[in-house]
Amino acid sequence: KTLVLGKEGESAELPCESSQKKITVFTWKFSDQRKILGQHGKGVLIRGGSPSQFDRFDSKKGAWEKGSFPLIINKLKMEDSQTYICELENRKEEVELWVFKVTANSDTHLLQGQSLTLTLESPPGSSPSVQCRSPRGKNIQGGKTLSVSQLELQDSGTWTCTVLQNQKKVEFKIDIVVLAFQKASSIVYKKEGEQVEFSFPLAFTVEKLTGSGELWWQAERASSSKSWITFDLKNKEVSVKRVTQDPKLQMGKKLPLHLTLPQALPQYAGSGNLTLALEAKTGKLHQEVNLVVMRATQLQKNLTCEVWGPTSPKLMLSLKLENKEAKVSKREKAVWVLNPEAGMWQCLLSDSGQVLLESNIKVLPTWSTPVQP
């Protein structure tokens, strides 16, 4: 018995070959002996029932001369899964057709961290297994239902699912979009007084994007977090609903989501969490944003450099006179030099030698006051 696997909605070709490689009389039947179609010696295709009933069934006339009399079934349905009989040259050929479909149980647009369920739609009597490969090459295998929990950004793209039935295979492709921000977390390093730009680019593109969002901020100096801004998103247009008075944030009207803080101040240093709830989706997108603020000051005979905000313990804070070795260098959030010599001093925040933030302060001879360029 020949086995053919097909995909729902597509076409299948059921083979029937003559040993003589020439046109001959043939008939295709259902297993209950109802006639589907055939050729009775005049080279004309004759259908077994009403056109509406058999309009999905056809053969390849061009192949008849070569002794091939396939049954073509178009717009395959699950109910087409059965045994078909080809009668020719006083023999009967049985061809078993199984029709399958692989679908994403939920929407194909899923939030990062959510679960994806892939379902193999199969007819009664089938014994399939399915193996799906994610865009990042991860394989999952199972029966008729496969689940992937905690979707990641790299899971966005084309999933390839191979259905196996009696050693035969049929392949399905499903496009999955993982809705997420491009970065889970970002850090902005700023000198005191500088303007701060926060950007929240999305890792996906959709024609219409509607939802609402909010930025909650936990300042390092504050005991509790507070909502800095709430906004709506309608067809990729951003409109601010409510904004705190301190700081007075500004928000861009177009994507990517963009926030401007007029100036970096120590009291704003800390961590924020931007959440975006999308229309018709359960759950929210999250991006963490961190602000580190640096201040260099000279008070009487003390030159001080401080940073506020979430810094890693491996970051180095240094004070050095321009073109000279660092006078002081510590894995701390404040460093100082007593009785600094005159000249341009640099405060540097660095990570393994890479400067993340620097602030310059000019120390004048002791009879004058310091100048901050």
Partner: antibody, heavy 125, light 107 residues
């Protein structure tokens, strides 16, 4: 433990309607294909309907086509059978049953292993 | 549809003895075949699937054999709780079908 509990059976006049429910517990309902099977009094078993885990693939036996509708609500772990235009010959105990599978290497074996206790439907004038 | 024919319709066997139940399919069902046990007022209980694989929790005294069109259920040493009606079942072609049942009675 895995459990299927049918409800909604009762006495109905010919031509009437009934909606049977099957409440599933003890397993992830949305992962499984489900079935309705019936048994007429003192008679053998008859497979009524088959539904895929997503609810997108459905099959009925010829005697109920156009009259019965199988459906499921995965969020509520429930399977349903809406029975319209009921006939005397639909009188039976209706069971809901889960399709299970076991696998050996790449080969998967499917079978109907878990059944509910059944609910009785009587169609009589 | 595939017609399943069970024989005998009834079988009287003494406890401790061996019982052999047969089932014939009107066309090949490969090994997509199962045996069920049903006691009065209860739902059928799966004994054997894939023609010869014992379901979870089924004692080793139950064994299934055959493929294609001829199948056999053997109960090696009958216990009092084994007296019931046994149904064979094919799940190769839709509609799935059952045999008419074999009633296993105490002799």
């Amino acid at each position: 433990q895995v459990q299927l509990v049918e409800s909604g059976g009762g006495l109905v006049k010919p031509g009437g309607s009934l909606r049977l429910s099957c409440a599933a517990s003890g397993f992830t309902f949305s992962d499984y294909y489900m079935n309705w099977i019936r048994q007429a009094p003192g008679k053998g078993l008859e497979w009524v309907s088959y539904i895929s885990s997503s609810g997108k693939t459905i099959f009925y036996t010829d005697s109920v086509k156009g009259r019965f509708t199988i459906s499921r609500d995965n969020a509520k772990n429930s399977l349903f059978l809406q029975m319209n235009s009921l006939r005397a010959e639909d009188t039976a105990v209706y069971y809901c049953a889960r399709e299970d599978y076991s696998n050996y290497e790449d080969y998967y074996y499917y079978y109907t292993g878990v059944w509910g206790k059944g609910t009785t439907v009587t169609v009589s004038s | 549809e595939i017609v399943m024919t069970q024989s005998p319709a009834a079988l009287s066997v003494s406890p401790g003895e061996r019982a052999t139940l047969s089932c014939r399919a009107s066309q090949s069902v490969s090994s997509k075949f199962a045996w069920y046990q049903q006691k009065p007022g209860q739902a059928p209980r799966l004994l054997i699937y894939n023609a010869s694989t014992r379901a979870t929790g089924i004692p080793a005294r139950f064994s299934g054999s055959g493929s294609g069109t001829e199948f056999t259920l053997t109960i090696s040493s009958l216990q009092s709780e084994d007296f019931a009606v046994y149904y064979c079942h094919q799940y190769k072609n839709w509609p799935y079908t059952f045999g008419q049942g074999t009633k296993l009675e105490i002799k």
